[in-house]
């Protein structure tokens, strides 16, 4: 009995579901009573799913299993696999058993996108050049292991002292933190690019350099130049930085933390006292750093309903504010691809592709092309629908007459995480069914 | 029109120098490094370094390092390579080419039209 | 050093066919460019960070690739396309180019 599989990985996002195909070819006459499926771990044998006696007899795997019952008799032998995680990263075994008996094996590759880049410098106050200074890239909760590479405003690699190092979390998600020694010229701008291997998505941020004195008089509040961007579920810091002068004592400090347009209290430090959180309780200071100035603010559990600018006070004896702003994101998943008409397509018919990614933020970027690579534009119709946590399910549809052949992309790009995601379909030009029976 | 103009060629005797010079126009010069890569007949392209024209950094390909050297003149928008002990092995087209982009992706997007410096006895 | 090798070093092809080059690289690279050149001029920008079209280049150009793996295509080969193309990286000193693919007329 031949029991067919994809050859390549099945690749899989972090938390959507993933369908491991397998398919065999019934005789005529065949009835389910007659079949024995079994998925099972290739390497430990472990039961994942089963049917046998004209019954499914369910998911022993975590209950994160199902098969196709409805195509069963056509012999689609499929198992979703629903929430992957990490842990499920591997090979699957497809067992058929009908009055023959017939085996194959499929991967299954996870995936999870790394976050933009965040880039901090130590010291970051009254540089000069000459000094040497510290730059730390750090990247969030990514799978697999991600590959980093630094260079300057010039796009001259920077290989020399950058140290990476990358932590896997209790999800299995990697956080990567590369740090890069310099010594600054006259001004620099500085370049790192995190790279998944698996879902060829880079996601880089850079930094400028301008050593020169801070001025005088008021007190000097520092943010960063450019948005944090945070991905939803995670926790985000929205970093500010004063400087102390000799002899400060927290009793001097009054710290505000305000959304800049709606000036509703977030959180507050005086009197000594961390005042706490006024903002859901999501809130939190960074205590035991007050005293060197670092008056960065953590926000636990990023929502959609967080982005915006959220404003830094500083009163010592002088004062001074800065505004640093919130951009939220969340990656969109691999677009599924749905035709319709799905059976007995020929030349010269008109087809619906419908390509649907889900629970993204912020808004996607659609684009469609054929197997040359040359843009699809017309006829094509992209909506995009916010949940109530404020995520976007994207559905766009590509109307077309179909040729002999042809292979139909789909590209879903998040602005923001610079993240691409793409599905596609190729349809042949023999009278066809899709999705293709084996 | 962004150009890049390479000076003519050259015969030159073996332990001998040549200065090679390329003349940028019709973009800000010390914004964009200038390379240089030659081509021996009937081979591929090999990377001999890189200037800055702003900070006046410069790169080499270990191969070159000790025979050449690259400089640039902002008053001019002059880049120029100098390769010196040259044998024969060194006969080949000399480009300069100006490496563009933004971060985090880069290209050679403009080259010299090639000078060729033959070594001969 | 990061070492390019380009597949096949040498092709045959016919107008029309479709035509794939690659370019291993010894370690893991950032992103790779293409370039074409024809004989007795100057290299020419076809693609750069792996998948992108330089300006002018005809769509029949693609790239693709990730790592230590990257693919150059001609989906449909035009006369004017018979040339020897180079992969090239910076991702790391020295800045090195695959020893080329010549592309000739079969």
């Known amino acids: 009995l031949e029991v067919q599989v994809p050859e390549d990985p099945v690749v899989a996002l972090v938390g959507t579901d993933a369908t491991l195909c397998c398919s065999f070819s019934p005789e005529p006459g065949f009835s389910l009573a007659q079949l024995n499926l079994i998925w099972q771990l290739t390497d430990t044998k472990q039961l994942v799913h089963s049917f046998a006696e004209g019954q499914d007899q369910g998911s022993a795997y975590a209950n994160r299993t199902a098969l196709f019952p409805d195509l069963l008799a056509q012999g689609n032998a499929s198992l979703r696999l629903q929430r992957v995680r990490v842990a499920d990263e591997g090979s699957f075994t497809c067992f058929v058993s009908i009055r023959d008996f017939g085996s194959a094996a499929v991967s299954l590759q996870v995936a999870a996108p790394y976050s933009k880049p965040s880039m901090t410098l130590e010291p970051n106050k009254d540089l000069r050049p000459g000094d040497t200074v510290t730059i730390t890239c750090s990247s969030y909760q990514g799978y697999p292991e991600a590959e980093v590479f630094w260079q300057d405003g010039q796009g001259v690699p920077l290989t020399g002292n950058v140290t990476t190092s990358q932590m896997a979390n209790e999800q299995g998600l990697f956080d990567v933190h590369s740090i890069l020694r310099v010594v600054l010229g006259a001004n620099g701008t500085y370049s790192c690019l995190v790279r998944n291997p698996v879902l060829q998505q880079d996601a880089h941020s850079s930094v400028t350099i301008t050593p020169q004195r801070s001025p005088t008089g008021a007190v000097e509040v520092q943010v960063p130049e450019d948005p944090v961007v945070a991905l939803v579920g995670t926790d985000a810091t929205l970093r500010c930085s004063f400087s102390p002068e000799p002899g400060f004592s927290l009793a001097q400090l009054n710290l505000i933390w305000q959304l800049t347009d709606t000036k509703q209290l977030v959180h507050s430090f005086t009197e000594g006292r961390d005042q706490g959180s006024a903002y859901a309780n999501r809130t939190a200071l960074f205590p035991d750093l007050l005293a060197q100035g670092n008056a960065s603010l953590r926000l636990q559990r990023v929502r959609v309903a967080d982005e915006g600018s959220f404003t830094c006070f500083v009163s010592i004896r002088d004062f001074g504010s800065a505004a640093v702003s919130l951009q939220v994101a969340a990656p969109y998943s691999k677009p599924s691809m749905t035709l319709e008409p799905n059976k007995d397509l020929r030349p010269g018919d008109t087809v619906t592709i419908t390509c649907s990614s889900y629970r993204g933020y912020p808004e996607a970027e659609v684009f469609w092309q054929d197997g040359q690579g040359v843009p699809l534009t017309g006829n094509v119709t992209t909506s995009q629908m916010a949940n109530e946590q404020g995520l976007f399910d994207v559905h766009s549809v590509l109307r077309v007459v179909l040729g002999a052949n042809g292979t139909y992309s789909c590209l879903v790009r998040n602005p923001v995480l610079q993240q691409d995601a793409h599905g596609s379909v190729t349809i042949t030009g023999q009278p066809m069914t899709f999705p293709p029976e084996a | 029109e962004v150009q890049l103009v390479q000076s003519g060629a050259e015969v030159k005797k073996p332990g001998s120098s040549v200065k090679v010079s390329c003349k940028a126009s019709g973009y800000s010069f010390t914004s964009y490094t200038i390379h240089w890569v030659r081509q021996a007949p009937g081979q591929g392209l090999e990377w001999m370094g890189y200037i800055n024209p702003n900070s006046r950094n410069t790169d080499y390909n270990q191969k070159f390092k000790d025979r050449v050297t690259i400089t640039a003149d902002k008053s001019t928008s002059t880049a120029y390579m100098e390769l010196s002990s040259l044998r024969s092995e060194d006969t080949a087209v000399y480009y300069c080419?100006?490496?563009?982009?933004?971060?985090?992706?880069?290209?050679?997007?403009?080259w010299g039209q090639g000078t060729t410096v033959t070594v001969s006895s | 050093d990061i070492q390019l090798t380009q597949s096949p070093s040498f092709l045959s092809a016919s107008v029309g066919d479709r035509v794939t080059i690659t370019c291993r690289a010894s370690s893991s690279v950032s992103y790779m460019n293409w370039y074409q050149q024809k004989p007795g001029k100057a290299p020419k920008l076809l693609i750069y960070?792996?998948?992108n079209l330089a300006s002018g280049v005809p769509s029949r150009f693609s790239g693709s690739g990730s790592g230590t793996e990257f693919t150059l295509t001609i989906s449909s080969l035009q006369p004017e396309d018979f040339a020897t193309y180079y992969c090239q990286q910076w991702s790391s000193n020295p800045l090195t180019f695959g020893q080329g693919t010549k592309l000739e007329i079969k």
């Open positions: 080419a100006r490496y563009s982009g933004s971060t985090p992706y880069w290209y050679f997007d403009v």
């Open positions: 960070a792996t998948s």
